[in-house]
Interface confidence: low
């Protein structure tokens, strides 16, 4: 008799990543009968919401519903109607909203309230919108990449499913760079985590993990740029800021009120004799790097070792996956190859930053100027953060793997967040083997 196709017994989940610069919606799918198996959940769709991050809607909360419409409608199309009511929807807001909450809890609550009301209007099983902590952001990013890399699986495979996979079950560290914060998360080697706020304990698939994590608020690439500008304008002799982090010939006017709008620049705030200043690019990598290093206070450390600003950081251990803006920026700069050494990256950054702005605009005509203008800064910032902030060296650079997707799923905190909230990562190893004979039809 001819085999009849059985109806697909699958489940879906939706996570919205409400970042500081934009919001993205991710749709995940998995076989219903394999919920507790490792590596079965995969991303089927990413929808980038048009517009800025939700924290920018403080003065126009009534526009949030429209803002979310396109991507939520896309989710309605992708997910079969019969599955809508049982598909959970989660929204997690990150450092942009943490900053807004620092300024005003009332305003942050108002934004989240409207977001919740908007998302409740869809036929899905809405589970709430919340500001996740920096610690959660780091932890869920770590869970995501190790889940996708198959690190939680106790089964040894005769084949490699991902290019970064190593034979052992040693987990990858996670390096996440956003617009407003950056996270470092990894399992240290036989090292006590000296600061309790940086310690996480997980039991996943029958194995215990003692994980270090820290989220540096205000050290995402966008807020770091605001910090650098606020620091440098303090010593400018007039309303012209000659900036080595922008290409020669680049010019942009900045409002002082915009500069001091974020809590991240408060430590540099001063009364300036002008309301605006003009950035004039001079495109010098070394000077840019030096200016960025001044954002990291490494003179004070109450522990055996620190990253910066007195924050404990254990000795680096194992391989690291660097994702989100770490990947997007380095991919644009064509620096994601495993074969590119740290010295080579530095050399290429020197050349890139020194290129005249007019030349850059011609070479990358399809890229929005706002983004294009900041790649010199962002690339230099990534180097500064990894080398100075996290103590990577030319030798250990090869242990950093710039990752965009793993097995078709974006590296980032959203998958780990959903896995946790849907209880799909068991503490103990499931008793049944993932592929039993009953699987075959």
């Amino acid at each position: 008799t001819q085999n009849k196709a059985l109806p697909e017994n699958v489940k879906y989940g939706i996570v919205l990543d409400a970042g500081s610069s934009h919001t993205s919606l991710y749709i995940y799918k998995w076989p219903a009968e394999k919920e507790n198996d490792t590596g079965v959940v995969h991303q089927v769709e990413e929808c980038r919401v048009k517009g800025p991050g939700i924290s920018k809607f403080v003065q126009k909360v009534n526009e949030i519903g429209i803002y979310l419409t396109d991507c939520m409608e896309r989710a309605r199309e992708v997910i079969p109607r019969s599955q809508h009511q049982e598909t959970p929807v989660y929204l997690g807001a990150t450092a942009g909203m943490r900053l807004l909450r620092m300024e005003s809890e009332e305003l942050a609550d108002r934004v989240l309230d409207v977001v919740e009301r908007s998302l409740s209007n869809y036929p899905f099983d809405f589970q709430g919108a919340r500001i996740i902590t920096g610690q959660e952001e780091g932890a869920y990013g770590w869970i995501t990449i190790n889940y996708l890399l198959g690190k939680f699986s106790q089964k040894t495979r005769w084949f490699s499913i991902v290019p970064y996979e190593t034979n052992n079950q040693e987990t990858f560290g996670a390096l996440d760079l956003g617009g407003a914060s950056t996270q470092v998360t990894f399992v240290p080697q036989n090292q006590t985590i000296e600061s309790p706020d940086n310690a996480l304990q997980f039991r996943l698939y029958g194995k215990d993990y003692n994980v270090y994590t820290h989220s540096f608020l205000c050290y995402g690439k966008d807020q770091a740029l605001w910090q650098k500008l606020a620091k440098d304008i303090q010593v400018a002799s007039n309303e012209i800021l000659r900036d080595p982090c922008f290409h020669p010939g680049y010019k942009k006017v900045v409002n002082v009120s915009d500069l001091y709008k974020t809590p991240c620049t408060k430590r540099f705030e001063m009364t300036l004799p002008f309301q605006q200043f003009e950035i004039q690019g001079i495109g010098n990598y070394q000077q840019c790097h030096q200016s960025i290093l001044e954002l990291f206070n490494t003179s004070y450390c109450p522990y055996s070792q620190c990253a910066f600003n007195g924050i404990f950081l254990p000795p680096l251990q194992g391989d690291f996956g660097a994702f989100s803006a770490f990947y997007f920026v380095m991919k644009f700069l064509n620096l994601t190859s495993e074969k590119v050494s740290q010295e080579k990256v530095t050399e290429m950054m020197k050349k890139f930053c020194a290129q005249p702005w007019e030349e850059i605009k011609t070479s990358y005509a399809g890229v929005k100027e706002k983004y294009l203008s900041e790649y010199c800064f962002s690339g230099t910032y990534i180097l500064s953060l990894l080398l100075q902030g996290y103590h990577f060296t030319a030798d250990s650079w090869e242990h950093i793997h710039f990752i965009g997707k793993i097995q078709g799923s974006d590296a980032g905190w959203t998958l780990g967040y959903m896995l946790n909230l849907t209880n799909m990562i068991p503490a103990e190893q499931p008793l049944s083997t993932p592929l039993s004979h009953s699987t075959y039809v």
């Epitope: 809890e105 610690q135 706020d197 540096f216 408060k266 600003n309």
Partner: antibody
Framework: SVEESGGRLVTPGTPLTLTCTVS????????MSWVRQAPGKGLEYIGI?????STYYANWAKGRFTISKTSTTVDLIITSPTTEDTATYFC??????????????WGPGTLVTVSS | AYDMTQTPASVEVAVGGTVTINCQAS??????LAWYQQKPGQRPKLLIY???TLASGVSSRFKGSGSGTQFTLTISGVECADAATYYC????????????FGGGTEVVVK
């Protein structure tokens, strides 16, 4: 480390400043809080000063207390003490650079007695 | 406004027994909950933060659980040294609150 000082016997209405002196802590990277405990009672949150210098107070404490800081100290001013303010006052450091989620380092406390 | 209600106010437990302390938030605080131990005449000591993460040096006999508005501290294999008052504390909001701490639970070890 964290240590409070300035607790003493005061008469009602006489402003009192308590000082929390820190060592090995960068106040530009840590939130600090003041918590009090009346004799035989529970812990009562007064307010915090975040790394940025912004202050937040419990509803009942607004106008009655003022928190400020220098690079190595965090002050709590009891603007017009009443007998109800008799308590041991603790200073505590927040866990994490910007976090106010929990308090992982506490001083031994300083006793304030308000009596006429 | 993020009021914390802790129960029971007092509990007696035998050495080797298990004690459970509950904490309820009047509004959703997600995972932003910590537990402290305080012995008479001493400063509070952080036991657990972010609901279930053990602070450095704290015995694994202490376990935190819960989410949203309902939280629990469980002490198993109770020892004499565990006699103390335990407080929960929400870290979700530091403004528009009357107290971030629960009223406390006195644990008496027999």
């Amino acid at each position: 480390s964290v240590e409070e000082s300035g607790g003493r016997l005061v008469t009602p209405g006489t402003p009192l400043t308590l000082t929390c002196t820190v060592s090995g802590i960068d106040l530009s990277n840590n939130a600090m809080s003041w918590v009090r405990q009346a004799p035989g009672k529970g812990l009562e949150y007064i307010g915090i000063i975040r790394s940025s210098g912004s202050t937040y107070y419990a509803n009942w404490a607004k106008g009655r207390f003022t928190i400020s800081k220098t690079s190595t100290t965090v002050d709590l001013i009891i603007t017009s003490p009443t007998t109800e303010d008799t308590a041991t006052y603790f200073c505590a450091r927040g866990g994490g650079s910007y976090s106010i989620v929990f308090w992982n380092l506490w001083g031994p406390g300083t006793l304030v007695t308000v009596s006429s | 406004a993020y009021d914390m209600t802790q129960t029971p106010a007092s509990v007696e437990v035998a050495v080797g027994g298990t004690v459970t302390i509950n904490c309820q938030a009047s509004e959703r605080i997600y995972s932003n909950l910590a537990w402290y131990q305080q012995k008479p005449g001493q400063r509070p000591k952080l036991l657990i933060y972010y609901t279930s993460t053990l602070a450095s040096g704290v015995s694994s006999r202490f376990k935190g659980s819960g989410s949203g508005t309902q939280f629990t501290l469980t002490i198993s294999g109770v020892e004499c040294a565990d006699a103390a008052t335990y407080y929960c504390q929400q870290g979700y909001s530091s403004s528009n609150v009357d107290n971030t701490f629960g009223g406390g639970t006195e644990v008496v070890v027999k």
